[in-house]
């Protein structure tokens, strides 16, 4: 029997301080270039080494960014989203959605090393 793959979705508020070279990440997505089928949301595609996001450590590649400084990123063109980040100021508050893959064992079976229970 194969194990099933579940996803644990969590949200987090991440406050970044813009570094000398910026915030230090790349994004994909937007209404004009959907990254996920039927989802025009904005996703993190790259965390730059030694950039502000990497040094903070919480933002991860694959995270969905829901808002920037309280401004919703729904239904934005890709370039408009880029511009929003660029003009976000020195202190930048990101509301992000992490999607963690959870590998479960076969239903009804608990592995020997399983700490639960």
């Amino acid at each position: 029997m194969n194990g099933r793959v579940d996803y644990l979705v969590t949200e987090e508020e991440i406050n970044l301080t813009r570094g000398p070279s910026g915030l230090g990440f790349n994004i994909v997505g937007g209404t004009d270039q959907q990254y996920v089928s039927n989802d025009s949301g904005i996703y993190v595609s790259r965390i730059k080494e030694n950039g502000a996001a990497a040094l903070d450590g919480r933002l991860q590649e694959g995270d969905k960014i829901l808002s920037v400084n309280g401004q919703d990123l729904k239904n934005l063109l890709h370039q408009d989203a880029v511009d929003l980040f660029r003009n976000a100021g020195y202190a930048v508050s990101l509301r992000v959605q992490h999607r963690l893959q959870v590998q479960n064992g076969p239903i009804g079976h608990r592995g020997e090393g399983d700490p639960s229970g």
């Epitope: 910026g22 790349n26 595609s45 790259r46 730059k48 370039q79 880029v82 660029r86």
Partner: nanobody, 127 residues
């Protein structure tokens, strides 16, 4: 390894136009972000314009917005900088630069530290 060769510089009067060209060889041109930087005498090299074909984005520095236009011809492996209404303060050595695009668009201003390939530069003098 990408090689970049600039051309088209020269001496012009204020208000005139020039078109710079940068021919690239040695890489898959369409997968590189291309940019122009410039360095005036006694000053640091500064960003002028960037074109990233794969991410459909074009950016300009505030000092050239509305006067300069960056464009590229992937079939010819060439990037251009059309400079109109030139001013004496545009006098500088103009450098073409390239870096391999990563997935997505950087949310940061173009930064020359990201560019790993540079041309030798072409002199533009506006009198």
């Amino acid at each position: 390894q990408v090689q970049l060769v600039e051309s088209g510089g020269g001496l012009v009067q204020a208000g005139a136009s020039l078109r710079l060209s940068c021919a690239a060889s040695g890489g898959t041109f369409s997968s590189y972000a291309m940019a122009w930087f410039r360095q005036a005498p006694g000053k640091e090299r500064e960003f002028v314009a960037e074109d990233s074909w794969s991410n459909h984005r074009v950016w300009y520095s505030d000092s050239v917005k509305g006067r300069f236009t960056i464009s590229r011809d992937n079939a010819k492996n060439t990037v251009y900088l059309q400079m109109n209404n030139l001013k004496p303060e545009d006098t500088a050595v103009y450098y073409c630069a390239a870096y391999r695009d990563y997935s997505g668009s950087t949310v940061d201003p173009p930064n020359q530290s990201e560019y790993n390939y540079w041309g030798q530069g072409t002199q533009v003098t506006v009198s």
